[in-house]
Amino acid sequence: IINGSDCDMHTQPWQAALLLRPNQLYCGAVLVHPQWLLTAAHCRKKVFRVRLGHYSLSPVYESGQQMFQGVKSIPHPGYSHPGHSNDLMLIKLNRRIRPTKDVRPINVSSHCPSAGTKCLVSGWGTTKSPQVHFPKVLQCLNISVLSQKRCEDAYPRQIDDTMFCAGDKAGRDSCQGDSGGPVVCNGSLQGLVSWGDYPCARPNRPGVYTNLCKFTKWIQETIQANS
């Protein structure tokens, strides 16, 4: 997250970190069910661990943390690398979470976002770009949803209705390492960090997010079929 600020503790209990050994974060994710996460399809790895209820990036033990294995990864069938469409994936945890103030699922919004809607994006991704500098603790940033037309102007021929753009002033954006993390609008999960320009936070180059309102049926049906 570029030019965000430290999230208040306990305010993002659905935020998950996807880790490679040894405790190396490579993507964010979101708890949407007691045993299921959503993340970006481009975050797919064969073997990984999931950390929930953790505030700092470092592997230091925190009393609210819960650790899991990802036992099943189900990318959306419409996702095709290196395209950006349908960039979402469900991850089944090896067991159900223990609900606490630090670990709690969030509902996926069935309403599509309106231009101007204020949202919050969070993650442990780099705080500088093109340099790489990772934060000590989870970062939060207020962003506004942009119209599809503004999005199309910024990224011609690359935008479809499985994506939405959001941004703030130049110099504020999600970035590498935030992928798969949540965009929360009006208390519901509206999007996942998907892609954007490089370097991050360039003027008139907003972040692009997976438009989850288009996938509520697929999410529900996939969880039910694999539970």
């Epitope: 309403h111 599509c112 976002p113 309106s114 231009a115 101007g116 809607t117 949803v145 119209s147 599809q148 037309k149 503004r150 199309e152 102007d153 910024a154 011609p156 021929r157 935008i159 479809d160 209705d161 008139n204």
Partner: antibody, heavy 117, light 110 residues
Framework: VKESEGGLFKPTDTLTLTCTVS????????ISWVRQAPGNGLEWIGY????????YYATWAESRSTITRNTNLNTVTLKMTSLTAADTATYFC?????????????WGPGTLVTVSS | AYDLTQTPASVEAAVGGTVTINCQAS??????LSWYQQKSGQPPKLLIY???TLASGVPSRFKGSGSGTDFTLTISDLECADAATYYC????????????FGGGTEVVVK
């Protein structure tokens, strides 16, 4: 913004209209083409983006319309192939204002295109 | 996608009266909606942009409201000069769009 002269065309002809702009940069404002058949409502044909000059079209117009621009000459061109009588209309070149939520804030006077055998 | 349905197709009101024109989007377009007035033989003129902001030189008798999918143009203290056709248009998306304009509403002033 001002459109070039329309005129009388035959079915199957190709229409080429040029819009000349002054007082602003095509790199800052998108340009749309809109048409209006006699006694009918406004019909959007397509537009060309400001920064990259990429064109988007209405679904009905996509297969036979091309919008291009020349930023040095301050012109935007609409080319429409395979004309039929249904293409008879007044064609407007319009400036879109991104600051105003892409409202159409400057309209040309329009040019009449008649398609008849 | 993002089709606009404008109602009514025609409305008649007396001088000094009020008319209300509705525009409904098939999907949420935030506040990216504008209103236009067109008189016979002339190009349309921008009245209101971003749902409720009055364009320069437009009298305050014209009022736009709404957001998301439902929008309204209200013309109060009607004058003879307000007799025209009014159109709404969306500026939210241009991909896979049939028409960005509503069908139009003819306002007749008695």
């Amino acid at each position: 913004v001002k459109e070039s002269e329309g005129g009388l065309f035959k079915p199957t002809d190709t229409l080429t209209l040029t819009c000349t702009v002054s007082g602003f940069s095509l790199s800052s404002y998108p340009i749309s083409w809109v048409r209006q058949a006699p006694g009918n409502g406004l019909e959007w044909i397509g537009y060309i983006t400001s920064e990259y000059g990429v064109a988007y079209y209405a679904t009905w117009a996509e297969s036979r319309s091309t919008i291009t621009r020349n930023t040095n000459l301050n012109t935007v061109t609409l080319k429409m192939t395979s004309l039929t009588a249904a293409d008879t209309a007044t064609y407007f070149c319009v400036r879109e204002n991104p600051t105003y939520g892409y409202a159409y804030d400057a309209w040309g006077p329009g040019t009449l295109v008649t398609v008849s055998s | 996608a993002y089709d606009l349905t404008q109602t009514p197709a025609s409305v008649e009101a007396a001088v000094g009266g009020t008319v209300t024109i509705n525009c409904q989007a098939s999907e949420s377009i935030g506040n990216e909606l504008s209103w236009y007035q067109q008189k016979s033989g002339q190009p349309p003129k921008l009245l209101i942009y971003q749902a409720s902001t009055l364009a320069s030189g437009v009298p305050s008798r014209f009022k736009g409201s709404g957001s998301g999918t439902d929008f309204t143009l209200t013309i109060s203290d009607l004058e003879c000069a307000d007799a025209a056709t009014y159109y709404c248009a969306q500026g939210f998306s241009s991909s896979g769009v049939e028409n960005v304009f509503g069908g139009g509403t003819e306002v007749v002033v008695k």
